[in-house]
């Protein structure tokens, strides 16, 4: 259905944008509180959205040092913004078998951001691999 695939595309474009925000934050990793955070890795199929919400819930924080505090806080806020709802996301919400956030290995900000980026890339890869060829506006 065209409008639902367009909605999915818009959703994945949002994921694409999140990768750039993660990359931006990686530049300021020394200005983040060096706290260990749950960082899902090798997420099992159908638990991607659950893992995604774990990354969003994590308490990534600026160390409030230097003049990078504003850009860091804005970037973190954007990472936590809820993406538009999709059928895939709704379906996965009903899965009770996905690991809880606390069960994932905790990692410092650098590895946390790298794993977040890997998950986002995996979700985009799944989306683009599962649909017919054509542009995001087709």
């Amino acid at each position: 259905h065209k409008s639902s695939s367009q909605g999915q595309d818009r959703h994945m474009i949002r994921m694409r944008q999140l990768i750039d925000i993660v990359d931006q934050l990686k530049n300021y990793v020394n200005d983040l509180v060096p706290e260990f955070l749950p960082a899902p890795e090798d997420v099992e199929t159908n638990c991607e959205w659950s893992a995604f919400s774990c990354f969003q819930k994590a308490q990534l924080k600026s160390a409030n040092t230097g003049n990078n505090e504003r850009i860091i806080n804005v970037s973190i806020k954007k990472l936590k913004r809820k993406p538009p709802s999709t059928n895939a996301g709704r379906r996965q919400k009903h899965r009770l078998t996905c690991p809880s956030c606390d069960s994932y290995e905790k990692k410092p900000p650098k590895e946390f951001l790298e794993r977040f980026k890997s998950l986002l890339q995996k979700m985009i890869h799944q989306h683009l691999s599962s649909r017919t060829h054509g542009s995001e506006d087709s």
Epitope: I13, Q17, K78
Partner: antibody, heavy 116, light 107 residues
Framework: QVQLVQSGAEVKKPGASVKVSCKAS????????MHWVRQAPGQGLEWMGT????????IYSQNFKGRVTMTVDESTSTVYMELSSLRSEDTAVYYC?????????WGQGTLVTVSS | DIQLTQSPSSLSASVGDRVTITCRAS??????LNWYQQKPGKAVKLLIY???RLHSGVPSRFSGSGSGTDYTLTISSLQPEDFATYYC?????????FGGGTKVEIK
């Protein structure tokens, strides 16, 4: 259809600033980030940075940090790129490009010439 | 920054020829590789995104393949309107970077 229309050519003196505009139409303006890319005469493409039109969040290339400012006028669906402290090496064609999964639509380019 | 090395930098070919352009990244870019076409005085056009996805309106004679660090753009049967400069671009990591370009000229 998606269209990005840029402002006309500019001639500037070294040390001056230039502000290039890019007016978007044919899609939901705030759904897509806008990137800026430049191309010096006879050279390849160089990424300058990006802006999210929904909240003016920016990411700039380290090569231009401190000299480039990207802004948005949501009421006219226009993105602006201002480059300050111009030098002769900034002579180039400047492009805006909408970003979905890639830079899927580009403006026609704006030639900026820096000459004393 | 991720470096992209395109080869060849230029090539001469005839209408109907099969043309292959390669792009090598300095690190694994996980298929986040796009191809663009540029003609003098015209807007840059996206041809292929995410290694092999054809952008809307792009003729099927254009195709892309690759993985890891090595990627290829193929034009199966060169048409008169295909004489242009082609660029690869990685979307894996900021900053966005482009290859040096490949100019396809008429033999």
């Amino acid at each position: 259809q998606v269209q990005l229309v840029q402002s006309g050519a500019e001639v500037k003196k070294p040390g001056a600033s230039v502000k290039v505009s890019c007016k978007a139409s044919g899609y939901t303006f705030t759904d897509y980030w806008m990137h800026w890319v430049r191309q010096a005469p006879g050279q390849g493409l160089e990424w300058m940075g990006t802006i999210d039109p929904s909240d003016q969040y920016t990411i700039y290339s380290q090569n231009f940090k401190g000299r480039v400012t990207m802004t948005v006028d949501e009421s006219t669906s226009t993105v602006y790129m201002e480059l300050s402290s111009l030098r002769s090496e900034d002579t180039a064609v400047y492009y805006c490009a909408r970003y979905g999964f890639a830079m899927d639509y580009w403006g026609q380019g704006t030639l900026v010439t820096v000459s004393s | 920054d991720i470096q992209l090395t395109q080869s060849p930098s230029s090539l001469s070919a005839s209408v109907g020829d099969r043309v292959t352009i390669t792009c090598r990244a300095s690190q694994d870019i996980s298929n986040f590789l796009n191809w663009y076409q540029q003609k003098p005085g015209k807007a840059v056009k996206l041809l292929i995104y995410y290694t092999s996805r054809l952008h809307s309106g792009v003729p099927s004679r254009f195709s892309g393949s690759g993985s890891g660090t090595d990627y290829t753009l193929t034009i199966s049967s060169l048409q008169p309107e295909d004489f242009a400069t082609y660029y690869c671009q990685q979307g894996h990591t900021l900053p966005r970077t482009f290859g040096g370009g490949t100019k396809v000229e008429i033999k």
